[in-house]
């Protein structure tokens, strides 16, 4: 019981995780304008990974895409993929663990063959939250970089005359919601891994049972019988969950600092 | 077609009080930031107050901040502009604006005359 | 605040002669979000209130005659009127829309010869 519900609660928590992760992914506000100790502004500039927004004070909102491959700064491009590819290992995910549900029967799928798919489904939200948050993690440095920049010359004096206020850009509402969705799908991902170890068939312990024969005594350990066919399952999901906890610990960890042109 | 039409203003003495209104039509008036624009007989116009569509925003001139309090009300297309501690440099026609692209005052309307002498 | 400065403060010409007006802004008007002068034009008759020209520093209002010419970029901005005609005749006016407070310029008042 407690192990459907610690897959089910995994589940839910990787779906939600993802359904962030692809709206992170899709909202503008990656970058927003800021608005503390900079002139009023009567327009409001926004970014996003796809195109940069500008909201008038009129009311309208014009945005405009990024129509070019080339142009674009890497590190926009390495975020593109990072939550490309976190998506897609977690929509990947999603399908597998549906079929690794225990409380969905499909046909005669055994509890070995299901521990393995929650197993599998896991290590991919696991996967995937570390690409949605690492990806999050590069632009918001990438930002951080970029404001302290534009902070040291926030002013360029033309002759002493003319100014030129540089448009600095903090955090956007984005960055949370994809922190916390890449949170919530490595947390997803954890609770599955767990759920699998509680879905593999464990090894029966059958105490020694001694049969009395007259005027023999012999004793029956079916433990040896059990290990000469092929019903002891639970050391190759021991096998793989090993590999499996291996996999989580080659996920490549990304530079703090990066260049942005 | 756009129409905004002032009403409200009239002569007031000095530190008196008195309300605007500006009744819209022709438009989605919720959709649209709106603003008061006042010009002094024979002076260039000035802006004096503006808010946003949904008055999430609102920003004052310097010299009518605390003494103005620019409002709408959705529901009836209108903008107000409330005004109190009237001084003789308040003297001028009031014109309420819609905004356009690039914040421009795409439309205004015939404006209403405030006169504040003693 | 941003100042914005008008010259000349009025010009003297003949109909169907070319007429350049200049605005200059303390700050520079350019959004680098989208890269786009935030910069107005008005005209303004006596008796009514000024009428939009031109937004975004060159885009022509619809219904305006392409005669007027909006171009400039950053702090230096002008009105060029290609032909004046009679109906032109009156003060101009260009407007910070960038910055709080939205500032006009003096204007420039065209006047016949």
């Known amino acids: 019981m407690a192990v459907t519900a610690c897959q089910g609660l995994g589940f839910v928590v990787s779906l939600i995780g993802i359904a962030g992760i692809i709206a992170a992914t899709c909202m503008d506000q990656w970058s927003t304008q800021d608005l503390y100790n900079n002139p009023v502004t009567a327009v409001f500039n926004y970014q996003g990974l796809w195109r940069s927004c500008v909201r008038e004070s009129s009311g309208f909102t014009e945005c405009r895409g990024y129509f070019t491959l080339l142009g674009l700064p890497a590190m926009l491009q390495a975020v593109r993929a990072l939550m490309i590819v976190g998506i897609v290992l977690g929509a990947i995910g999603l399908l597998v663990s549906i079929f690794a549900l225990k409380c969905i029967r499909i046909g005669s799928m055994e509890d070995s063959a299901k521990a393995n798919m929650t197993l599998t489904s896991g290590i991919m939200f696991i996967v995937s939250g570390l690409c949605a948050i690492a990806g999050v993690s590069v632009f918001a440095n990438m930002l951080v970089t970029n404001f302290w920049m534009s902070t040291a010359n926030m002013y360029t004096g033309m002759g002493g005359m003319v100014q030129t206020v540089q448009t600095r850009y903090t955090f956007g509402a984005a960055l949370f919601v994809g922190w916390v969705a890449g949170g919530l799908t490595l947390i997803g991902g954890v609770m599955m891994c767990i759920a699998c170890r509680g879905l593999a068939p464990e090894e029966t312990n059958y105490k020694a049972v001694s049969y009395h024969a007259s005027g023999h005594s012999v004793a029956y350990k079916p433990g040896g019988f059990k290990a000469s066919t092929g019903f002891g399952s639970n050391t190759k999901n021991k096998k793989i969950y090993d590999g499996g906890a291996r996999t989580e610990d080659e996920v490549q960890s990304y530079p703090s600092k990066h260049d942005y042109v | 077609e756009v129409k905004l039409v002032e009403s409200g203003g009239g002569l007031v003495q000095p530190g008196g009080s008195l309300k605007l209104s500006c009744a819209a039509s022709?438009?989605?008036?919720?959709?649209?930031?709106m603003a008061w624009v006042r010009q002094a007989p024979g002076k260039g116009p000035e802006w004096v107050a503006f808010?946003?569509?949904?008055?999430?925003?609102?920003y004052y001139a310097d010299t009518v901040t605390g003494r103005f309090t620019i409002s709408r009300e959705n529901a009836k297309n209108t903008l107000y502009l409330e005004m109190s501690s009237l001084r003789s440099e308040d003297t001028a026609m009031y014109y309420c604006?819609?905004?356009?692209?690039?914040?421009?005052?795409?439309?205004w309307g015939q404006g209403t005359l405030v006169t504040v002498s003693a | 605040d941003i100042v914005m400065t008008q010259s000349p403060s009025s010009l003297t010409v003949t109909a169907g002669e070319k007429v350049t007006m200049s605005c200059k802004s303390s700050?520079?008007?350019?959004?680098?979000?989208?890269?786009?002068?935030?910069l107005t034009w008005y005209q303004q008759k006596p008796g009514q209130p000024p009428k939009l020209l031109i937004y975004?520093?060159?885009t022509r209002e619809s219904g305006v005659p392409d005669r007027f010419t909006g171009s400039g970029s950053g702090t230096d901005f002008t009105l060029t009127i290609s032909s004046v005609q009679a109906e032109d005749l009156a003060v101009y006016y260009c407007?910070?829309?960038?910055?709080?407070?939205?500032?006009f310029g003096a204007g420039t008042k065209l006047e016949l010869k």
């Open positions: 604006a819609r905004l356009g692209y690039g914040n421009s005052f795409a439309y």
């Open positions: 022709g438009f989605t008036f919720s959709r649209y930031g």
């Open positions: 407007q910070n829309e960038l910055f709080y407070p939205l500032t």
């Open positions: 975004w520093a060159s």
């Open positions: 700050q520079s008007l350019l959004n680098s979000g989208n890269q786009k002068n935030y």
């Open positions: 808010i946003s569509n949904s008055a999430y925003s609102i």
